[in-house]
């Protein structure tokens, strides 16, 4: 018997079709993904193959102004009308806290939505039993496939889950659910979920009775053969992983942003066992056409969008100054403001030792593309920001060792005076450079706001710490010069829509006014 | 809406057999299990066994295995239970039941089936 | 088999009494437990399942607590149509198994 999953993860809210880095689309006939172009080439494969399931590995939540806007109606709509068939919680479906997950997805989603190892508690409980599971047994043709569900425990620091949701661990967790499918006589289980592929692969390796894993949260591009586009695979598409038992378990995910379709063919034989798995992710390329039906709903809904960048988030007393003359050769007020939202947004107060669990923002100035002048009486809107933070990217939570950091700061300053965008504006940090000393070796002070501490205050960076830090993710993946980031990062968190970040803390302060104030000094 | 209609009540002698069915309707009858329990009386409820319409799998509780069997008409969306060797002991109502394949609770029940089994 | 052991297997109340019925598991079933209401000559219908989860058209004052291997069927205020038998029925492990059921009496 054989069945084909079609899969997605990590869409967050490219509903539109985008350019080939996932941004906005700028030049059509070279765009790809969105979920009109995603219909179509489902469909195609509806028709042509029986056995067909349409899986999403979580966080639909998050990224462009879409969710800014709709706040997850957009997700269950577009879902619904692609009729998926089940999808796992990721961290950012709980941006919106649990409230902004019940009402516009839960409440709405006609295919069922998964996670075993999310348990609620309190009064939380009646309210969203029933409205997400452990799993689902679906029907698909004359066989029935049992598809169990989970999310990265990290994600009470991840997100906004509230505190009457625990977050297990997801082998723990796993385990007693695939049992009981075991129980009713489903023997093929596909494991649907949002923890990484390194949790993926353990999934695999150490939950009994799962035949497939379908991840997410990695943004993990799998692929055999030459790639299609600019993504470098990680490994070959299905990734294997030869369980503690002895069982070959395909493990796959398709990147993210909608770009592919994950293509997956399993064959059981009659007793649920995995014979074969083949297949590879397909590129959303504009060799397929959109769906005319689907693109006409989006341009609908669209409408909304428009109106909404033109609005008053909030107000600016002060020049905020985006300018590169400042932003890439010192402290600039522009760089302050986004390094405060940006630690704002990820304020979890999850242990009483700690006010927060992260202090510390770094951000390219070549990432700050414009200022805004507070003379146009001092609106702030979405589009002013747009101007600000173009690329559409995230701010993301990464784990370094302070001797990366240091590193990261001589990076910022070796080639000084040239303009260029790797000088870092800061949030949570005190640096002081000396430039008349040799590249490599300007740092002459490096102070970091404590976090294990009821009085935050500013201590010196140690090189063998481990520090959390809130960064672009163009500089998480090595941008600017950044490899040293990149290929010392002991772990990446995917973060929440850059302009949403900074958007959302302006109209929670309604009245701004950051001051250049000593984070960046030169002696 | 959701109905489940089962067949008439039975008289029947011991060693004998009874075939209870039951019709659905108001929901896709391929996509729900249909369960069998039974209650003696005066006594509490007892689960049987059940059907997946879809692919006609069947479990069932280990006292009836054997003596138990039940089958499914697509056609007609209607599946039965058929009892043997009955004894006097499987007097009871016999209930169908719609479950979800995955959480075995009882949503919607058919009116109940009395079968005596009586020399 | 998982055994369901309700108690108690019979009460006398009043209207607008509070009403306590528990079911006990002789092995943890993960929160799998239903609630069914049966009056004499009818069907029994569904009350709650997942433990806590109100099936439509069941009255507030009906609600479920628990976990593990005990749980608790509460009727907040007793109304003249709930006198009735009540079963807890456990669905995590085969054969499905239900409680011995509790007779709610008026007192």
């Known amino acids: 018997w054989e069945l084909t999953i079609l899969h997605t993860n990590d869409v967050h809210s490219r509903l539109e079709q985008t350019s080939e880095d996932s941004s906005k689309c700028v030049n059509a006939s070279r765009c790809m993904g969105g979920v009109a172009r995603l219909f179509t080439k489902v469909q195609q494969i509806r028709r042509a193959e029986p056995n067909v399931l349409l899986l999403d590995a979580g966080d639909q939540y998050q990224g462009t102004i879409w969710f800014t806007v709709y706040k997850g109606a957009e997700v269950a709509h577009f879902m619904n009308a692609l009729r998926y068939d089940a999808m796992a919680l990721g961290n950012h479906e709980f941006d919106n806290g649990v409230e902004g997950l019940i009402e516009p997805l839960l409440k709405e989603a006609k295919f069922p939505i998964l996670s075993a190892n999310i348990k609620a508690k309190g009064p939380l409980a009646s309210q969203i039993s029933g409205l997400y599971l452990p799993y689902k047994v679906l029907p698909v043709g004359d066989e029935v496939v049992g598809i169990v569900g989970y999310t990265s425990k990290e994600t009470p620091f991840l997100s906004n889950p509230g505190t009457n949701l625990v977050f297990e661990d997801e082998i723990t967790a796993l385990q007693p659910e695939v049992d009981k499918l075991k129980t009713l006589n489903v023997n093929k289980i596909i494991a649907l979920g949002h923890s990484g592929f390194e949790m993926d692969k353990l999934i695999a390796q150490k939950v009994r009775g799962v035949d497939v894993v379908v991840g997410g949260h990695s943004n993990t591009f799998l692929y055999t053969g030459n790639p299609p586009s600019k993504e470098v695979p990680a490994g070959k598409y299905p990734f294997i992983v030869t369980s503690d038992d002895g069982r070959k378990v395909p493990v796959v995910q398709a990147y993210a942003f909608g770009k592919y379709l994950g293509y997956l063919k399993i064959e059981f034989d009659e007793r649920g066992n995995v014979i074969s798995s083949h297949g590879n992710p397909i590129l959303l390329n504009s060799s397929i056409p959109e769906d005319p039906s689907i693109k006409a709903d989006i341009n609908k809904w669209r409408i909304k969008l428009d109106n909404y960048s033109t609005q008053e988030l909030g107000k600016t007393i002060v020049y905020l100054d985006g300018s590169s003359q400042s932003c890439r050769f010192r402290e600039c007020n522009m760089g302050n403001l986004i390094c405060d939202a940006m630690i704002n947004n990820n304020l979890r107060h999850t242990d009483e030792m700690f006010w927060n669990h992260v202090s510390m923002c770094i951000l390219n100035g070549g990432g700050i593309r414009s200022p805004i002048d507070e003379r146009n009486n001092g609106t702030i809107t979405w589009e002013n920001l747009a101007a600000v933070l173009p690329f559409g990217g995230t701010f993301d939570l990464v784990q370094l060792k302070g001797s990366t950091l240091k590193k990261a700061f001589e990076h910022s300053v070796h080639r000084y005076g040239q303009s260029t965008g790797e000088f870092l504006q800061v949030g949570g940090i005190h640096v002081v450079y000396d430039l008349s000393r040799k590249p490599g070796d300007r740092v002459v002070k490096l102070d970091v706001l404590c976090t294990k501490c009821r009085v935050p205050s500013y201590d010196p960076l140690k090189m063998d710490e481990v520090y959390k830090v809130i960064l672009p993710n163009f500089l998480a993946n090595g941008g600017d010069g950044f490899q040293m980031i990149k290929d010392e990062l002991l772990r990446h968190d995917s973060g929440d829509q850059d302009i949403n970040v900074v958007s959302t803390y302006i109209s929670k302060m309604k009245v701004i006014y950051p001051a250049v104030e000593g984070r960046i000094k030169f002696s | 809406q959701v109905q489940l209609v089962q067949s008439g009540a039975e008289v029947k002698k011991p060693g004998a057999s009874v075939k209870v069915s039951c019709k659905a309707s108001?929901?896709?009858?391929?996509?729900?299990?249909m369960h069998w329990v039974r209650q003696a009386p005066g006594q509490g409820l007892e689960w049987m066994g059940a059907?997946?319409?879809?692919?006609?799998?069947?479990s069932y509780a280990q006292k009836f295995q054997g003596r138990v069997t039940m089958t499914r008409d697509t056609s007609t969306s209607t599946v039965y239970m058929e009892l043997s060797s009955l004894r006097s002991e499987d007097t009871a109502v016999y209930y169908c039941?719609?479950?979800?394949?995955?959480?075995?609770?009882?949503?919607?029940w058919g009116q109940g089936t009395l079968v005596t089994v009586s020399s | 088999d998982i055994q369901m052991t309700q108690s108690p297997s019979s009460l006398s109340a009043s209207v607008g009494d509070r009403v306590t019925i528990t079911c006990k598991a002789s092995?943890?079933?993960?929160?799998?437990l239903a609630w069914y209401q049966q009056k004499p000559g009818k069907a029994p219908k569904l009350l709650l399942s997942?433990?806590?989860s109100l099936e439509t058209g069941v009255p507030s004052r009906f609600s479920g607590s628990g976990s593990g291997t005990d749980y608790t069927l509460t009727i907040s205020s007793l109304q003249p149509e709930d006198f009735a038998t009540y079963y807890c029925?456990?669905?995590?492990?085969?054969?499905?198994?239900f409680g011995g059921g509790t007779k709610v009496e008026i007192k």
């Open positions: 039941a719609r479950g979800d394949y995955d959480e075995s609770y009882f949503d919607y």
């Open positions: 108001g929901y896709t009858f391929t996509t729900y299990n």
């Open positions: 059907i997946f319409p879809g692919n006609g799998h069947i």
């Open positions: 092995e943890g079933i993960y929160n799998r």
């Open positions: 997942g433990v806590i």
């Open positions: 029925q456990q669905y995590w492990s085969i054969p499905w198994t």
